[in-house]
Interface confidence: medium
């Protein structure tokens, strides 16, 4: 993080009403922070959403945005017929420009785009477009959601009535009705060429306050193919001053965007203000927590036949998942530890975000192989007890897989946790390998801006002389499509071997729904050549471990050093036709509760990998060369590593296991703290012997890594 001192007061810019221009003859003006008297605000920290009400009373109102839209409660409004769009099919002029406001990236529309119908009180003119996104790999970034399902990006188009006001800003400042469209972007395997001018523009506004003219684009092409299915409700600006003047049109159909195109959003920088120090950070997770519906009604369009096929292919079963059944983000901080020679303890932490509280219990599933027979057991654990489970009678010859799922009321479930593999054996083929989540099943290369050389960490546990080791594998984007054709053996084996440097391709996440029907034995795993697993169907499902977990960015409810389970005013809250009800004593006012406040979240810090030697070809384990190097145990609870007595946590034994390249920013750190990776990959000639030692900078710092990148055939660098 770069810091520099500024001498002007911490004032704001970038809220939706403030973004107007003074450029090329335009009457409107983008107000600069230093000249403006508007309050400073942010998406996290001391100026985060919970504190917006301190400077803007409207942010505590009862008709706030964004909201979650429950389709089953939305009533069809006969007045909500086809939208009339005028000018949307024209190419934009070369005066259309984009600006990095520090809070969003905005497109200032220079042409005449009008919308009417949909119950809008008049003919509204489009003023600008803004975007909201998550932190990486298609993680949830949208502000609105449908049936609890959030999307990687939300595009918002803002309108005002030019018959009533001479400018958008006048409408805002006079607290008069404006219109807004919300369009979701969903991950797709291919680039969306309609977005090319936007993506190209993003690359020109990487830094705060940068501006660039946009190549011509067609605004209609940025909207869903079908405009007939939309929701309508009355709400607010989603940024201060949170004025409750917005007639929202939320399109149900998403627009496709590829991972590659998403990277352009994740590469945007902002400056954050703290007292008189500004820091340069990635602009990520720029969405407001969802608000309660209160006495409002959400309506849906009455356009004939527009909902029919949509309902089945998207809402009920969006891309192979049942999003409406997901009641929380996954349990986190999965850990497996040996208690003794024959027992293991699985522990985890409650999900960061609970959409439909309370959590009633947890289901622990574990599966193993012995003599080619696969067995699986599932049992439940009450949520009010220690989040630990003990597995006894562990066989040293078996490979165990563990995963945990939260169970809410009405048998609603969370996404599955990270899947942990554990093996206590003598050959130790998988010894200590931790496969760090790549989150990009489609093996698309990480962008240079986000490509931190992260190690695949390891942990060798020894109890009474018996070496234990585990492999943790992330569950991919989850909840994933069950349409993946990869066999379980190939998924497990290729992922493991790829993580050990055997693989011929990019490492895939372990898809959460490809739960083994048969697991590879240690022997078979060592013999099978690795294949890259490209679970492309997986890539399409947005919510998941990162998907809906929307990390608590502002330590909601935390003030004066205290933790509080509630968020600002009604921030972070939702309710649907059950205003007066509370889901549980503990989370009275919060339909979306954030369980991980101001703490390291989701992903553990990686630590260096264990010393498995490989043949030069990279496809075979060399037997008989297992040295008992000690590696630092992975601490799943965050960025610290406790090396134990006599161990320097920063001095570990190097190996030739390549680090897993990952685009995932570790959610354990502040998502706004960017990784500042060394952009230059290790040259292929840089090889180190197993006895080499190196320093690993604490992963919490995330600006460098001591891991050695050993080339693997076909691996993307």
């Amino acid at each position: 993080v770069l810091h520099y001192v500024v001498c002007f007061p911490a004032l704001t810019e970038g809220y939706v009403g403030a973004l107007h221009e003074n450029r090329h003859g335009s009457a409107v003006q983008i107000r600069r922070r230093k000249a403006s008297g508007d309050p400073y605000w942010a998406y996290s920290g001391a100026y985060g959403p919970e504190h917006w009400v301190t400077s803007s009373v409207s942010c505590g109102g009862r008709h706030q945005s964004p909201i979650d839209i429950l389709d089953q409660y939305a009533r069809v409004g006969e007045e909500y017929q086809e939208l009339q769009l005028d000018g949307f099919d024209n190419e934009s002029s070369n005066k259309t420009w984009m600006k990095n406001t520090g809070k969003t990236v905005a497109i200032l529309l220079k042409d005449d785009y009008f919308v009417s119908g949909a119950g809008l009180p008049g003919r509204f003119k489009a003023e600008k477009v803004e975007f909201h996104w998550g932190h990486s790999n298609g993680s949830a970034g949208s502000e609105h959601s449908i049936n609890g399902r959030r999307f990687p990006v939300e595009m918002q188009i803002f309108f005002y009535n030019p018959d009533d006001f001479d400018s958008f800003q006048t409408a805002i400042s006079e607290n008069r009705i404006i219109g807004a469209m919300a369009i979701f972007f969903q991950v797709s395997p291919r680039d969306n060429s309609a977005l090319d001018p936007i993506i190209h523009g993003l690359k020109g506004v990487v830094h705060h306050e940068k501006e660039t003219f946009l190549d011509p684009f067609v605004l209609r092409d940025l909207l869903p193919a079908s405009l007939g299915s939309y929701y309508r409700y009355t709400g607010s600006l989603t940024t201060p001053p949170c004025s409750e003047i917005v007639e929202w049109i939320v399109f149900r159909r998403p627009v496709p965007i590829s991972y590659h195109q998403l990277e352009a959003f994740y590469s945007i920088f902002t400056t954050e203000q703290q007292d008189h120090v500004k820091s340069v950070e990635y602009l990520r997770n720029n969405f407001r927590p969802q608000q309660r519906l209160h006495d409002r009604v959400v309506s849906k369009s009455a356009v004939r036949d527009s909902w029919n096929h949509d309902m089945t292919d998207f809402l009920e079963n969006p891309l192979g998942t049942e999003a409406s059944k997901v009641c929380s983000s996954p349990p986190i901080h999965m850990k497996v530890q040996p208690l003794n020679q024959t027992a293991l303890q699985v522990s985890w932490s409650q999900p960061e975000t609970i959409y439909h509280p309370p959590i009633m219990n947890y289901m622990i599933s574990y599966s193993w192989t012995k003599n080619e027979d696969e067995k699986e057991k599932t049992f439940t654990k009450d949520s009010d007890k220690d989040l630990k489970a003990t597995i006894s009678h562990v066989s040293p010859d078996s490979l165990y897989l563990f995963r945990v799922q939260a169970v809410c009321r009405n048998d609603m479930r969370s996404d599955f946790s990270q899947t942990m593999l554990f093996q206590a054996n003598t050959t130790r083929i998988f010894q200590g390998t931790r496969i760090v989540k790549t989150g990009v099943p489609t093996a698309s290369p990480a962008s240079s801006a986000d490509m931190a050389p992260i190690s695949s960490g390891s942990s060798t546990w020894t109890s009474s002389g018996i070496p234990f080791s585990f492999v943790s594998m992330a569950t991919g984007m989850g909840p994933s499509s069950s349409g993946s054709q990869a066999t379980v053996a190939s998924v497990v084996t290729s992922t493991l071997l790829a993580g050990l440097g055997f693989g011929g391709g990019g490492i895939s996440s372990f898809p959460s729904t490809v739960w083994p029907t048969r697991l590879p034995t240690a022997a078979s795993a060592s013999k099978q050549a690795a294949r890259p697993v490209l679970a492309t169907t997986e890539a399409l499902a947005s919510p998941g471990p990162d998907g809906d977990s929307s990390p608590t960015k502002d330590g909601e409810g935390t003030e004066e050093g205290e933790k509080d389970e509630k968020s600002e005013s009604e921030d972070g809250e939702r309710e649907h036709e059950e205003d007066g009800e509370k889901d549980s004593e503990k989370k009275e006012k919060s339909g979306v509760t954030h369980a991980a406040e101001e703490r390291n979240q989701t992903e553990p810090s990686p630590t260096p990998s264990s010393p498995n030697r490989t043949a030069e070809g990279g496809h075979q384990t060399i037997p008989g060369h297992e040295q008992d190097h000690t590696a630092v145990p992975t601490d799943q609870t965050g960025g610290r590593r406790d090396a134990g007595p006599g161990l320097d946590p920063d001095m570990v034994t190097s190996t030739q296991v390549p680090p897993t390249a990952t685009e995932e920013q570790y959610a354990g750190s502040d998502p706004k703290r960017p990784e500042m990776p060394s952009k230059k990959p290790m040259s292929r000639g840089d090889r180190f012997s197993e006895d080499s030692r190196f320093i690993t900078v604490n992963p919490a710092e995330k600006n460098t890594s001591g891991m050695i990148s050993r080339p693997a055939p076909g691996r993307m660098e």
Epitope: P39, Y40, G61, R62, H63, N175, R292, K566, S569, E581
Partner: antibody
Framework: QSLEESGGRLVTPGTPLTLTCTVS????????MSWVRQAPGKGLEWIGT?????YTYYASWAKGRFTVSKTSTTVDLKITSPTTEDTATYFC??????????WGPGTLVTISS | SFVLTQPASVQVNLGQTVSLTCTAD??????ASWYQQKPGQAPVLLIY???SRPSGVPDRFSGSSSGNTATLTISGAQAGDEADYYC?????????????FGGGTQLTVT
């Protein structure tokens, strides 16, 4: 951080009166400020709030009778046409929505003919 | 309009625990704050967001909320706790925003 009210005095009914809250140690552009009053022997009564953006909010009974405005370091409360019922101690407070520990000591306004 | 109801007066013996209540129709959807006011002084914030205590407030003071009732609990009441106690909350939306105080409870410590 401090707040101090001033301007309280004895006036006759119908004579406009402006109270001033002078702040130091924090920025009015980043904080909502409220006026609260307390008639002798009675409870606290919220009058109105001006937020960091300059938006104003009033109690339903106070609309038209009071006006809240601000400069860079002061927040004013104008009592447009006082009546005897407006006799009270007037407090200014910083952001009372979620609870504020910053209150001025109050200024006494007496409306009497 | 939105009304917060508090008992007019409550008595507690020295060293005992006392609970002051504040009720309203839809308080379950709102945050309550509690203020202590001694004669001739400005109010002092005791509890905000139902349960949070600002620094400097003794931990004898605690807040809770259940259903449409917010409660301020004072454990080990002391003579210095004798004062008026007000609950407050915000109501409304946008330009119709309202901040509401309860009528206050006079606490007597005997």
């Amino acid at each position: 951080q401090s707040l101090e009210e001033s301007g309280g005095r004895l006036v006759t009914p119908g004579t406009p009166l402006t109270l001033t809250c002078t702040v130091s140690g924090f920025s009015l552009s980043s904080n909502a400020m409220s006026w609260v009053r307390q008639a002798p022997g009675k409870g606290l009564e919220w009058i109105g709030t001006i937020d960091g953006y300059g938006y104003t909010y009033y109690a339903s009974w106070a609309k038209g009778r009071f006006t809240v405005s601000k400069t860079s370091t002061t927040v004013d409360l104008k009592i447009t046409s006082p009546t005897t019922e407006d006799t009270a101690t007037y407090f200014c407070a910083r952001e009372i929505y979620l609870g504020s520990n910053f209150w001025g000591p109050g200024t006494l306004v007496t409306i009497s003919s | 309009s939105f009304v917060l109801t508090q008992p007019a007066s409550v008595q507690v013996n020295l060293g005992q625990t006392v609970s002051l209540t504040c009720t309203a129709d839809t308080l379950s959807r709102r945050y309550a704050s509690w203020y202590q006011q001694k004669p001739g002084q400005a109010p002092v914030l005791l509890i905000y967001r139902d349960t949070s205590r600002p620094s400097g407030v003794p931990d004898r003071f605690s807040g809770s909320s259940s259903g449409n009732t917010a409660t301020l609990t004072i454990s080990g009441a002391q003579a210095g706790d004798e004062a008026d106690y007000y609950c407050a909350t915000a109501d409304g939306s946008g330009s119709s925003y309202q901040f509401v105080f309860g009528g206050g409870t006079q606490l007597t410590v005997t």
